[in-house]
Interface confidence: low
């Protein structure tokens, strides 16, 4: 008799996802030196264990902790790059400037980046059909509180300057529903970090204006001065000659606007 | 379009020290910067430089572990400790951003009025 098995509204664990994690922590762990002694069997069981046989809809940042412990590691402090709904161009400056760092620059990050995965109450298996959606189901499934989690983590680890990656070309350039939003701009500690600084990415062309202006980020610097915390902002008004610069910031075209 | 306007010079003793400052106004760019300087009757000469992020810095000899740049990208300004000051420091230190190769001396795309320094024996 078929078991009758929940369906939920977003797609299922990616397929391979146990060889993917584990494919991950070995590259990871061969190409950054400091994390050579994680042993990648261990990371995939705690990771494993942090939601096979439990609901998908009642995953606690508890069920991480293993995992977490397992990945702990020290990033500087000063490097951080927070971005929010403009990930891609994020991480191209993060693998030209290599000594600055996204969450998915860690290991946590990197194993799970791009990643679905949840299971099944009382069972092992992992289901590959269907996961909740965190609108729709419900927001403590396994996706979203692993986010949750290492986000805050990461926030948390900041000092400093911390750099944040803003998409201009979106209605609500700063969204306080984000995972920036409503998770790493409360756990930034106001005692460590001196200043957020926002670079807010032009997406068109011939667009002049001062995005810095708007009133999500205005609504962003009053929360953020409200923590005792300085603010400022950078418009980037071409992000392809932004990439360019930085990889080569001799060309002399670098030396004016972007 | 960039503008840059130097502070911070005046007069001070042999062997004491001032900091030179550089605000930074105009649109955000991606330019390395540094401080130059002119003495009377000679050439502009490089002095310090530094990169927009990873904050690489680089030095002429004659003022390496004497003079110590670095820039606050959040309060766009550019910095020029200067400690253990010497007669032949005096000159007018200019701020440029957009060098096109550290050091050189002539090269970059945006100056600053200069700022005089005079160092009294």
């Known amino acids: 008799v078929p078991r009758w098995r929940q369906q939920w509204s977003g797609p299922g664990t990616t397929k391979r996802f146990p060889e993917t994690v584990l494919a991950r922590c070995v590259k990871y762990t061969e190409i950054h030196p400091e994390m050579r002694h994680v042993d990648c069997q261990s990371v995939w069981d705690a990771f494993k264990g942090a939601f096979i046989s439990k609901h998908p809809c009642n995953i606690t940042e508890e069920d991480y902790q293993p995992l977490m412990k397992l990945g702990t590691q020290t990033v500087p402090c000063n490097k951080i790059l927070l971005w929010s709904r403009i990930k891609d161009l994020a991480h191209q400056f993060t693998q030209v400037q290599r000594d600055m760092f996204t969450l998915e620059d860690t290991l946590l990050g990197y194993l799970a980046d791009d990643l679905t995965w949840c299971g099944e109450f009382n069972t092992s298996k992992i289901n590959y059909q269907s996961c909740p959606d965190w609108r729709k189901d419900c927001s403590n499934n396994p996706v979203s509180v692993f986010w949750k989690t290492v986000s805050r983590r990461f926030a948390e680890a900041a000092c400093d300057v911390v750099h944040v990656m803003l998409n201009g070309s979106r209605s609500k350039i700063f969204d306080k529903n984000s995972t920036f939003g409503s998770v790493e701009v409360h756990n930034l500690q106001p005692e460590k970090v001196q200043t957020l600084e926002a670079w807010v990415i032009h997406g068109g062309r011939e667009d002049s204006r001062d995005l810095c202006q708007d009133p999500t980020i205005k609504e962003l610097e009053s929360i953020i001065s409200k923590r005792n915390i300085q603010f400022s902002c950078k418009n980037i008004y071409r992000p392809d000659k932004f990439l360019q610069c930085v990889k080569n910031p001799e060309d002399s075209s670098c030396t004016s606007e972007i | 379009q960039v503008q840059l306007q130097e502070s911070g010079g005046g007069l001070v003793q042999a062997g004491g020290s001032l900091r030179l400052s550089c605000a930074i106004s105009?649109?955000?760019?991606?330019?390395?910067m540094g401080w130059f300087r002119q003495a009377p009757g000679k050439e502009r000469e490089f002095q310090a430089g530094?990169?927009?992020?990873?904050?690489?810095?680089y030095y002429a000899d004659s003022v390496k572990g004497r003079f110590t740049i670095s820039r606050d990208n959040t309060k766009n300004t550019l910095y020029l400790q200067m400690n253990s000051l010497k007669p032949e420091d005096t000159a007018i230190y200019y701020c440029?951003?957009?060098?096109?190769?550290?050091?050189?001396?002539?090269?970059?795309?945006?100056w600053g009025q200069g700022t005089q320094v005079t160092v009294s024996s």
């Open positions: 105009g649109r955000t760019f991606i330019a390395d």
């Open positions: 440029a951003a957009g060098l096109k190769r550290i050091g050189d001396q002539r090269e970059a795309d945006y």
């Open positions: 530094i990169t927009w992020f990873g904050g690489s810095t």
